[in-house]
């Protein structure tokens, strides 16, 4: 004969567990009906009733199958700084990241809690590792033989125009003069620029600024309790 | 609006049965997720929950007191009632029922009847 | 059965300090624990439950957290009305008070 299938609430048998999306609830001692994403748990079972859910309100959410008596809160809105990459639904968190030239200074588990702008190098500084969605632009002097003349947080040393007849030698903030009307190039001319850190969830870590490079806001924020797990929420 | 009265003896014998009636209004006990419930509270000492009877039927007792309890309903008369026996006087105390919501916390409570138990 | 430590079972603060009780479960309660305020010959009222969520009416200088077994109650800053006695209840498993915590004004 096929074993007979449980219906919730069930007493389990000694030693076993729950099945998927049920819950063992030990004041009723009993499995019990875990909520879907998106609800939560209304009344909790009994040992002759099982869990009756609810849809969560407006502005807070379930993610997981759970039994907890409350949605979680959805965070706050996204900042002017930040962009709003998953709206708030019943099932799930809104999330924010960082607009363009701006990077993650305090991560939270899904998006950013804060960000920003990216560093900028000023002139005779260019651009040793760009910044990304996580850690700031680092600046770096540029070497004998390459310039820099911007403020930029994209732009790299280049090196100076090789002269037939040099004019004005070039430093680390200005390229050479030449006299000659057909100066010779190592590199392609103008300004090279490094792609701006495109937007993907990643962990952050804390940038080590450098002492050459132009100022930049530090950030220190105590972090806010981070929203309640859902309890027991796991399939 | 919630509110929930209890009603018993003042005094009863040790070894006597006590009987306590908890009326309430505001709402059902045919209503999913509503239970009432009993908590006691000994002379300048802590709470002590000792029992408490869901919308279903189903029935939850203090274990060390399990032996004692009784509880039961009558919906219609929006009443729950609790009998202890084999009173003895450590079992002086302030008496209270309190309606327990779904999600199993006591919100509202009555103001509680004293019973004192001596010869 | 779950056993509920709550310290301290009393205090002394003047009116505007911050009050602290905390109670410890002896197992893990899944943040199913409420908080009640006592004053003499009344019955307890409801200030907070599932660890953090205030009732409705009750002012914001209450609040809680915790989870696990370790569960905080704060008075932000003590106001005379405040002058009670202060219960745990945890409901994750049956349900048990906690010893209670007298908290009186300096």
């Known amino acids: 004969l096929p074993a007979q299938v449980a219906f919730t609430p069930y007493a389990p048998e000694p030693g076993s567990t729950c099945r998927l999306r049920e819950y063992y609830d030990q004041t009723a001692q009993m499995c019990c009906s875990k909520c879907s994403p998106g609800q939560h748990a209304k009344v909790f079972c009994t040992k002759t009733s099982d869990t009756v859910c609810d849809s969560c309100e407006d502005s807070t959410y379930t993610q997981l199958w759970n039994w907890v008596p409350e949605c979680l809160s959805c965070g706050s809105r996204c900042s002017s700084d930040q962009v709003e990459t998953q709206a708030c639904t019943r099932e799930q968190n809104r999330i924010c990241t960082c607009r363009p030239g701006w990077y993650c200074a305090l991560s939270k588990q899904e998006g950013c809690r804060l960000c920003a702008p990216l560093r900028k190098c000023r002139p005779g500084f260019g651009v040793a590792r760009p910044g990304t969605e996580t850690s700031d632009v680092v600046c770096k002097p540029c070497a004998p033989g390459t310039f820099s003349n911007t403020t930029s947080s994209t732009d790299i040393c280049r090196p100076h125009q090789i002269c037939n007849v040099v004019a004005i030698p070039g430093n680390a903030s200005m390229d050479a003069v030449c006299t000659s009307t057909s100066p010779t190039r190592s590199m392609a001319p103008g300004a090279v620029h490094l792609p701006q850190p495109v937007s993907t969830r990643s962990q952050h870590t804390q940038p080590t600024p450098e002492p050459s490079t132009a100022p930049s806001t530090s950030f220190l924020l105590p972090m806010g309790p981070s929203p309640p797990a859902e309890g027991s929420t796991g399939d | 609006q919630v509110t929930l009265k209890e009603s018993g003896p003042a005094l009863v014998k040790p070894t006597q049965t006590l009987t306590l009636t908890c009326t309430f209004s505001g709402f059902s006990l045919s209503t999913s997720g509503m239970g009432v419930g009993w908590i006691r509270q000994p002379p300048g000492k802590a709470l002590e929950w000792l029992a408490h009877i869901w919308w279903d039927d189903d029935k939850f007792y203090n274990p060390s007191l399990k032996s004692q309890l009784t509880i039961s309903k009558d919906t219609s008369k929006n009443q729950v009632v609790l009998t202890m026996t084999n009173m003895d006087p450590v079992d002086t105390a302030t008496y209270y029922c309190?309606?327990?919501?779904?999600?199993?916390?006591?919100?509202?409570w009555g103001q509680g009847t004293t019973v004192t138990v001596s010869s | 059965d779950v056993q509920m430590t709550q310290s301290p079972s009393s205090l002394s603060a003047s009116v505007g300090d911050r009050v602290t009780i905390t109670c410890k479960a002896s197992?893990?309660?899944?943040?199913?624990i409420a908080w009640y305020q006592q004053k003499p010959g009344k019955a307890p009222k409801l200030l907070i439950h599932?660890?953090?969520t205030l009732q409705p009416g009750i002012p914001s200088r209450f609040s809680g957290s915790g989870s696990g077994r370790d569960y905080t109650f704060t008075i932000s800053s003590l106001q005379p009305e405040d002058i009670a006695t202060y219960y745990c209840?945890?409901?994750?498993?049956?349900?048990?008070f906690g010893g209670g915590t007298k908290v009186e004004i300096k």
């Open positions: 599932y660890t953090s």
């Open positions: 197992q893990d309660i899944n943040k199913f």
């Open positions: 309190a309606r327990i919501t779904g999600t199993r916390y006591f919100d509202y």
């Open positions: 209840l945890q409901y994750g498993n049956l349900w048990t």
